[in-house]
Interface confidence: low
């Protein structure tokens, strides 16, 4: 008498999440009499997946009619596959008895579930940094299977190389997560720059997912300050201007001081944007020279984006005021944060 064989022809089957999986199983003989059952996993902790005779298995259906005479095909179809369904499935023949006795198992079919990664989420630094500093961006994507995945970083279309990427967990799992950190050196021209995290996976059929972050949320471009005196007016008033240029973000407060005393404070708002995304602002102060006996020290004090104030001072020469037409005397630099004066 030929020994009964339980044949599971596929060693592995890969299915997309949400689809149906067909697990094939045939037996070589109708003898001995007894049922076929499907299990996930082996050993005492195995999970019953399908038993024709009893139980309720709403997602599992037999491929062929198991009640027909001489049926030797015990393949099943599992619908609405999720990553949690991954594992090795065994088709097992039992000999009829009280109770039934396990006779022979198939070699097993490993079901792997192809699950799409979630849309990559890119997050930037919590605080802004200035040009020449390095900032880190993080990209996360979750819920994918199989584990093989490719992640690339781009800045303005150019691939970044200072990248560290981890896929978790390291061992077998129903689904995986990827987390990658890219280090980017900022330049003053990066207000309009963008970083892109691109994730490629077998489930995406060549159409990678992308997450983006704007460097405008990560960068601070400190202003240039220049204080100049315009021409003296006939009424003995001097117009002194403070030009604040090439700064980002727009959050900026400017204070004029006359001989150390606050004269006027202004907040920048609704400024036109430069081509590179930065802003310029010009403020002016009229000084009545005839009201002063001594030279007047004017200070333009700028607080940008919560940073320490930067000063630039300028002395208006009262003694020479009748002749100082169109003077453009160089401003004296008394910045409390010298790095921000260019």
């Amino acid at each position: 008498e030929e020994e009964l064989q339980v044949i599971q022809p596929e060693k592995s089957v890969s299915v997309a999440a949400g689809d149906s999986a067909t697990l094939n199983c045939t037996v070589s003989s109708l003898i001995p009499v007894g049922p076929i059952q499907w299990f996930r996993g082996a050993g005492p902790g195995r999970e019953l997946i399908y038993n024709l005779k009893e139980g309720h298995f709403p997602r599992v259906t037999p491929v062929s009619d198991p009640t027909k005479r001489n049926n030797m095909d015990f393949s099943i179809r599992i619908s609405n596959i999720t990553p949690a369904d991954a594992g090795t499935y065994y088709c097992v023949k039992f000999r009829k008895g009280s109770p039934d006795v396990e006779l022979k198992s198939g070699a097993g079919t490993e079901l792997s579930v192809r699950a799409k990664p979630s849309a990559p989420v890119v997050s930037g630094p919590a605080v802004r940094a200035t040009a020449e500093h390095t900032v880190s961006f993080t990209c996360e994507s979750h819920g994918f299977s199989p584990r093989d995945i490719t992640l690339k970083w781009f800045k303005n279309g150019n691939e970044l190389s200072d990248v560290q990427t981890n896929v978790d967990p390291a061992g077998k799992s129903v689904s995986y997560s990827i987390r990658s950190t890219a280090r980017v050196v900022l330049t003053r021209r990066d207000v309009h720059s963008q970083v892109i995290c691109e994730v490629a996976h077998v489930t995406l059929q060549g159409d990678p997912l992308r997450g983006t972050a704007n460097l405008s949320e990560a960068i601070r471009v400190p202003p240039f300050l220049e204080v100049t005196q315009q021409s003296m007016r006939a009424d003995n008033q001097v117009n002194v201007t403070c030009q604040v240029t090439k700064f980002y973000p727009q959050r900026l407060q400017l204070t004029w001081l006359e001989n150390g005393n606050v004269s006027r404070t202004e907040m920048a708002s609704a400024l036109p944007e430069n081509k590179d995304g930065t802003y310029n602002w010009t403020s002016w102060l009229l000084v009545n020279v005839s009201a002063h006996r001594d030279d007047v020290k004017l200070t333009c004090q700028v607080e940008h984006d919560g940073q320490p104030a930067v000063n630039k001072s300028f002395s208006v020469k009262v003694s020479a005021h009748p002749k100082e037409q169109g003077s453009n005397t160089a401003a004296e630099n008394t910045g409390t944060n010298e790095r921000n004066i260019y």
Partner: antibody, heavy 121, light 107 residues
Framework: EVQMLESGGGLVQPGGSLRLSCAAS????????MSWVRQAPGKGLEWVSA????????HYADSVKGRFTISRDNSKNTLYLQMNSLRAEDTAVYYC??????????????WGQGTTVTVSS | EIVMTQSPATLSVSPGERATLSCRAS??????LAWYQQKSGQAPRLLIY???TRATGIPARFSGSGSGTEFTLTISSLQSEDFAGYYC?????????FGQGTKLEIK
């Protein structure tokens, strides 16, 4: 038993601030992304904000961006929502919810019972 | 942002009958869609995720289908406890967005 309990709701004037808390128990808090969802009186559900398990990534609805901040303290198993510059239209029941296992990928399968925020002068 | 539109706003069905609720997305959300049930005065409960996968403990009479922009929640034989509000939510693109809801009431 898996539980989430919100607190910190109340009556606040327009322009004011509130901080909501959500204390979680019965599961490994740091392994799950969390979310805040609100429901104005007689209206439908509105997703407000989400934060990853590690706290490294956050997301906001356009209606609250720049005013609300989501955060978490995994050592205390607590989720927070700092609400500033509150408006009358922020009046709602605020629910905290946990995503089901795979971070943001599936639905929110554990919910608190909600805390009421009323913004009125 | 992706706009989710549910129809009808109110659905009147007799107990034991089938109820079919629809949800449409303004652009494709793949299968990244969840359905929630909310009873009056209670927090929402997750019914379906991945467009068609039942959440833990959800009875087999609840089923979801669809992909892309068109989705359906079907309750095969309505029980008294099923009369409630139902919401769909997409989680394909930030910000995640809910539909405006369908109220299922006893006919």
């Amino acid at each position: 038993e898996v539980q989430m309990l919100e607190s910190g709701g109340g009556l606040v004037q327009p322009g004011g601030s509130l901080r909501l808390s959500c204390a979680a128990s019965g599961f490994t808090f740091s392994s799950y992304a969390m979310s805040w969802v609100r429901q104005a009186p007689g209206k439908g559900l509105e997703w407000v904000s989400a934060i990853s398990g590690s706290g490294s990534s956050t997301h906001y609805a356009d209606s609250v961006k720049g005013r609300f901040t989501i955060s978490r303290d995994n050592s205390k198993n607590t989720l927070y929502l700092q609400m500033n510059s509150l408006r009358a239209e922020d009046t709602a029941v605020y629910y905290c919810a946990a995503y089901s296992g795979s971070y943001y990928y599936y639905g929110m399968d554990v919910w608190g019972q909600g805390t009421t925020v009323t913004v009125s002068s | 942002e992706i706009v989710m539109t549910q129809s009808p706003a109110t659905l009147s069905v007799s107990p034991g009958e089938r109820a079919t609720l629809s949800c449409r997305a303004s652009q494709s959300v793949s299968r990244n869609l969840a359905w929630y049930q909310q009873k009056s005065g209670q927090a929402p409960r997750l019914l379906i995720y991945g467009a068609s996968t039942r959440a833990t403990g959800i009875p087999a009479r609840f089923s979801g289908s669809g992909s892309g922009t068109e989705f359906t929640l079907t309750i095969s034989s309505l029980q008294s406890e099923d009369f409630a509000g139902y919401y769909c939510q997409q989680y394909n693109n930030w910000p995640y967005t809910f539909g405006q809801g369908t109220k299922l009431e006893i006919k």
